[in-house]
Interface confidence: low
């Protein structure tokens, strides 16, 4: 829908800084496909850790680590010429303003690590 | 910092539906260290496409799209033995609600794809 | 913010040992792979050793392997380089860095290893 015309951008400098939030998520099951097991047939693998934190929304956050070093060959072996690196994004997430559990929060940055890819390295490893 | 006891948890059935969020983001700049080229470097690249939306906070969210079907082997030439997938995660962005500038959100996923993995296929091409 | 601060280099002996210690904050070194650099003068940087602390994969180069030892502890977020044996060579600034990758890189300032009779 266009934004209705003379609503600031809620980027814009003169937007209100303080907002109503509606927690009933729109498209809850949005990801209704089943969960994908990339993470063990990439050739560079992961492992999901789960990180929680009861005072942020979602409290629940599932964390990629690479298992390797390398990445993993056509014959299982881990190749040291590539390297497996986490591809980050960051995501916002509701932080609970510590105000005696009055219903204020906090927009907040959070870094995540999503899964792994294999990349050529710049600088390879000394032999 | 702990929970205050007897605060609901924002996931809980009694949390209030709607809350005051505070759009001053704390970590802003989380992410300090310079883009990654990753994109460029994987066995499995991709291309960044800019999915804007005025109506949405953030406005502006960069998705992958793999540029190959198969992945990119030593020589540079694209195996089709191996699959290029896209990393995907569920993200909460704000949409805004449609109430004539009033400054009510309410909380949306969404489906991003955030770059891309090379992965063994569970059915190979035929040779 | 993101932070790694390198500590524990110094003057020592052909054959001594030193401990470095790095210690990160503004993320969990558990998250990520971990690692030593090191720079001698008028020389390109090199990968020293890294820690992957999931499945204990380590990488270690072979000017210094049996030597030197990498090691995590999560729980205070700082990763070590226990360095036995030491040889002239090995002089240069140590540096602590996320070792995944040699090129999108979270660095630390550098502490000066220096061997020397």
């Known amino acids: 829908s266009p934004q209705n015309p003379g609503c600031p951008n809620a980027e814009d400098k003169n937007f209100p800084r303080t907002v109503m939030v509606n927690l009933n998520i729109r498209n809850r099951n949005t990801n209704s496909k089943r969960a994908s097991d990339y993470y063990n047939r990439s050739s560079s693998p992961w492992n999901l850790h789960r990180n929680e934190d009861p005072e942020r929304y979602p409290s629940v956050i599932w964390e990629a680590k690479c298992r390797h070093l390398g990445c993993v060959d056509a014959d299982g072996n881990v190749d040291y010429h590539m390297n497996s690196v986490p591809i980050q994004q960051e995501i916002l997430v509701l932080r609970r303003e510590p105000r005696h559990c009055t219903n204020s929060f906090r927009l907040e940055k959070m870094l995540v690590s999503v899964g792994c890819t294999c990349v050529t390295p710049i600088v390879r490893h000394v032999a | 910092s702990p929970q205050n006891p007897g605060c609901p948890n924002a996931e809980d059935k009694n949390f209030p539906r709607t809350v005051m969020v505070n759009l001053n983001i704390r970590n802003r700049n989380t992410n300090s260290k310079r883009a990654s080229d990753y994109y460029n470097r994987s066995s499995s690249p991709w291309n960044l496409h800019r999915n804007e939306d005025p109506e949405r906070y953030p406005s502006v969210i960069w998705e992958a799209k793999c540029r190959h079907l198969g992945c990119v082997d030593a020589d540079g030439n694209v195996d089709y033995h191996m699959n290029s997938v896209p990393i995907q995660q569920e993200i909460l962005v704000l949409r805004r609600e449609p109430r004539h500038c009033t400054n009510s959100f309410r909380l949306e996923k969404m489906l991003v794809s955030v770059g891309c993995t090379c992965v063994t296929p569970i059915v190979r091409h035929v040779a | 913010e993101v932070q790694l601060v390198e500590s524990g280099g110094g003057l020592v002996q052909p054959g001594g040992s030193l401990r470095l210690s790095c210690a990160a904050s503004g993320f969990t070194l558990g998250y990520y792979a971990i690692g030593w650099f090191r720079q001698a003068p008028g020389k390109e940087r090199e990968g020293v050793s890294c820690?992957?602390?999931?499945?204990?994969?380590?990488y270690y180069a072979n000017s210094v392997k049996g030597r030197f030892t990498i090691s995590t502890d999560n729980g205070k977020n700082t990763v070590y380089l226990q360095m036995n044996s030491l040889k002239p060579e090995d002089t240069a600034v140590y540096y602590c860095?996320?070792?995944?990758?040699?090129?999108?890189?979270?660095w630390g300032q550098g502490t000066q290893v220096t061997v020397s009779s």
């Open positions: 820690d992957s602390s999931s499945d204990g994969d380590t």
């Open positions: 860095a996320t070792c995944t990758d040699w090129n999108y890189d979270y």
